[in-house]
């Protein structure tokens, strides 16, 4: 049987050793305890009794099924505990009574069909996360559950086949910040969402089928609902059950971020909110990011026209990989207050965009991601944007595109353009003269020779070059990122002609360690403040008996430096 | 340059199965869809159905839904099509092709002769 | 399913005229302001290739003497000045629903 490895802090890790019971010679030097992912089953009343000092202890996936009353009665310091994914079938408030430091505690994975007979957490008064339940057996949420729980940062409830919820079981926590439920049906969802209005900031619902979701007036007086942030992972939702969702919104007049990951509309975004929805609902809401949404016919999707209204407000969306090819001209109208769009990992080409980006569209707009979609001609892009009067930031990059032109129309009050990842081999005046920021890293680029009179930060990582960009070229420049290219050295005079320049990342990069290079490196120790990475990342490529030693720590010949 | 390497032509058994593919290459494989379109001796073109290397998912023509089965290896960036329970019917030209801007076929394979005789 | 039917199923045409190739569809194909509508032209032996999206855009690298218009359920290709390279077929193509559908093809040739 292999042992533990422990560091001199008394972090150690006996993750993966096969033990079959809690090692011995344990001791009270230890601070952090890995046993997790062995087959340990059983862990009896003096197996932990020696770690007086410990804070932390995972037991993750160790196949345990028993464990004594009084086993952690020594545990008084432990802050983690983690006994997920074991084979624990019930729970005793027994093991949790001397714990009282204990900050995060995870029970999920365990085959427990409700939490133990008795209140499990009422000595955890210092718990910041728990996380409880299981996907097969975790059946019943019952008032006792959660007694004396009065604050938690995180709570996770794995509840896939809950069967029945006790009103009013989770509304003993007084203030939750992060809810996160998993819950295979909505059946319960009104009745829980009715006990946590008053106590959580940010509630996630994962992998709830929302089809048949059906919203009736919750049983609350008027409450003033703290909760911020609404995600749905992995659900399903139809266009009916959209339609009810919205409904719970006029609970949470606070909300200001709505998110949808990995979800699936069964329907066409045919929504027909009634018209006291959409007046009063998503009043604060500022933010609303997609992901990954899955829409089975989305050639039918509709313009959304019925929900215009509701998002005339709305500062920030992202919809990531969707499959979107084409936002309606009317739809980008109607976003009079939009800031920002992120439309990444879509199959946005310039032809449609040009429908997207019509006269009056996004009047707001100020940053536009459209990273990673379809597009082909720089030159068109730019064109078609001109519409967007207020457009200062673009993100263009994972495209390909097209050889530049020479010249090119952007929207004048473009400062930020990031052309990473397109397959540029030269760049031309056809980028605008206007930018702080140009992001043009990994590309093709073996040179740079553009003038950029308000350049304030180059990124040009990942290309081909072989020395520094002219310094004339960007006469106030503060930052510049250039590692992974093919530059060979710099010098006193090269860093002294940039005026301005703060930061300069010029790591891995093949540099041939000349007397020249050598010999500034040493003389110059005030290189650390402006180097990113130094020493670490500056390796000599050549000469051959200096390869892959520090800049820092190289030192010429005598004999090849005097000739 | 970006390009669609089909595999070369197959003569099967009726009631055989078939795997084509169609090696991707010169642009980035999990950005775009994969098509496949079949061309019957001297006629026009029949859309099979598109998958998604990024994601994997499909969608099918009705008529070839229980004809053909489409996936992907992005590591080798290749798509395939395996054609099952083959009838003289399936007899034809195979393409594959790029599905940019969500709604366009921008670049072609050679396509794949396939022959079910016996 | 939408059906495309192109008219006329063979042309004749002078080389240096225009020839005019029409495809109707059953229904319309308009996604709030585009028309997803291409067409393709397809040499003897050979894979088809791009040569007009979304109705009345040139494919890059198509020479300007191809050209595409139209709108909801009617759409012609023009190709004026004929050159003798045209001589070949060509198909529309609708993605405005699911399954995709294609024309039955026009077949150019030399009058």
């Known amino acids: 049987q292999e042992s533990l490895s422990c560091d001199a802090s008394g972090v150690c890790d006996g993750r993966s050793r096969s033990f079959t019971s809690i090692p011995s010679g344990l001791t009270a030097a230890m601070k952090s305890l890995d046993l997790s992912f062995n087959k340990i089953t059983y862990i009896g009343h003096g197996d932990l009794r020696a770690c007086a000092n410990l804070q932390v202890l995972m037991l993750k996936s160790s196949r345990i099924n028993t464990i004594e009353g009084d086993a952690f009665y020594s545990l008084g310091s432990l802050e983690h505990l983690d006994l997920s994914d074991n084979h624990l079938s019930s729970l005793s408030s027994s093991w949790f009574g001397p714990l009282s430091s204990l900050k995060y505690l995870n029970l999920m994975g365990n085959p427990y069909q409700t939490l133990g007979v008795t209140s499990l957490f009422p000595n955890l008064t210092n718990l910041q996360t728990l996380r409880i339940g299981n996907v097969e057996t975790f059946s019943e949420i019952r008032r006792i559950d959660f007694a004396g729980l009065t604050s938690l940062n995180e709570l996770e409830i794995k509840a896939l086949s809950l069967r029945n919820y006790q009103s009013q079981s989770l509304k003993s926590i007084r203030d939750i910040h992060h809810l996160t439920l998993h819950l295979s049906e909505s059946a319960f969802l009104l009745e829980i969402f009715a006990d946590i209005l008053s106590s959580v900031r940010y509630l996630e619902l994962r992998d709830t089928n929302l089809a048949r979701f059906q919203f009736s007036p919750l049983p609350v007086d008027e409450v003033s609902s703290p909760m911020k942030k609404l995600a749905f992972r992995g659900s399903v939702l139809t266009d009916e059950s959209f339609n009810e969702l919205l409904k719970l919104l006029r609970y949470i007049l606070e909300l200001s971020e709505v998110e949808f990951d990995d979800c699936t509309l069964n329907g066409l975004g045919d929504f027909n909110p009634s018209e006291s929805d959409v007046v009063s609902e998503l009043g604060k809401v500022e933010t609303v990011t997609i992901r990954r949404l899955h829409i089975p016919q989305f050639y039918l999707f509709y313009d959304l026209s019925t929900v215009y209204s509701l998002l005339e407000k709305v500062k920030r969306i992202t919809v990531e990989n969707s499959k979107v090819f084409l936002v309606p001209c009317s739809f980008s109208q109607h976003l009079k207050s939009l800031e920002f769009l992120d439309l990444s990992e879509n199959l946005m080409v310039e032809e449609y965009l040009k429908n997207s980006a019509c006269k009056g569209a996004w009047p707001s707009l100020q940053t536009l991601v459209l990273s990673q979609n379809h597009l082909r001609s720089m030159q068109k892009t730019g064109e078609i944007l001109l519409t967007l009067k207020n457009l200062t930031s673009l993100d263009i990059s994972r495209n390909t595109f097209h050889p530049m032109p020479d010249s090119c129309q952007w929207p004048e009050k473009m400062r930020f353009l990031n052309l990473s990842s397109t397959g540029i081999r030269v760049v031309k005046t056809c980028i605008p003269q206007t930018l702080e920021v140009l992001d043009v890293s990994n590309n093709n680029l073996d040179s740079f020779s553009l003038f950029l009179p308000r350049l304030q930060e180059l990124y040009i990582s990942r290309n081909k070059l072989k020395t520094l960009p002219d310094a004339s070229l960007f006469p106030v420049l503060l930052v510049m990122k250039i590692r992974e290219n093919a530059v060979s050295t710099f010098s006193k005079d090269q860093l002294g002609s940039f005026p301005k320049l703060e930061t300069l990342e010029a790591g891995d990069n093949h540099f041939v360690c000349s007397c020249e290079l050598l010999s500034f490196t040493m003389e110059t120790p005030a290189l650390a403040q402006i180097l990113v990475d130094w020493p670490d990342s500056y390796l000599c490529d050549s000469p051959p008996r200096l390869h892959g030693h520090r800049l820092q720590d190289a030192r010429p010949s005598v004999l090849e430096c005097h000739q | 340059q970006v390009q669609l390497q089909q595999s070369g032509p197959e003569l099967v058994n009726p009631g055989a199965s078939v795997k084509l593919s169609c090696k991707a290459s010169g642009f980035t494989f999990t950005t775009y869809g994969i098509n496949w379109v079949k061309q019957g001796p001297g006629q026009g073109l029949e859309w099979i159905g598109w998958i998604y290397p990024r994601d994997g998912s499909t969608n099918f023509n009705e008529n070839f839904k229980d004809k053909a089965a489409l996936t992907v290896d992005t590591s080798s960036s290749t798509a395939y099509m395996e054609l099952h329970s083959l009838t003289s019917e399936d007899s034809a030209v195979y393409f594959c092709a790029r599905l940019t801007g969500g709604t366009f076929l921008d670049y072609w394979g050679q396509g794949t002769t396939l022959t079910v005789s016996s | 399913d939408i059906v495309l039917t192109q008219s006329p199923a063979s042309l004749a045409v002078s080389l240096g005229q225009r020839a005019t190739i029409s495809c109707r569809a059953s229904?319309?194909?308009?996604?709030?302001?585009?028309?997803?509508m291409q067409w393709y032209q397809q040499k003897p032996g050979q894979p088809p290739k791009l040569l007009i999206f979304g109705a009345s855009n040139v494919e890059s690298g198509v020479p300007v003497r191809f050209s595409g218009s139209g709108s909801g359920t009617d759409f012609s290709l023009n190709i004026h000045p004929v050159e003798e390279d045209d001589i070949v077929m060509y198909f529309c193509q609708q993605s405005r629903k699911l399954p995709w559908t294609f024309g039955g093809g026009t077949k150019l040739e030399i009058k």
């Open positions: 229904e319309s194909v308009e996604y709030y302001g585009t028309s997803l």
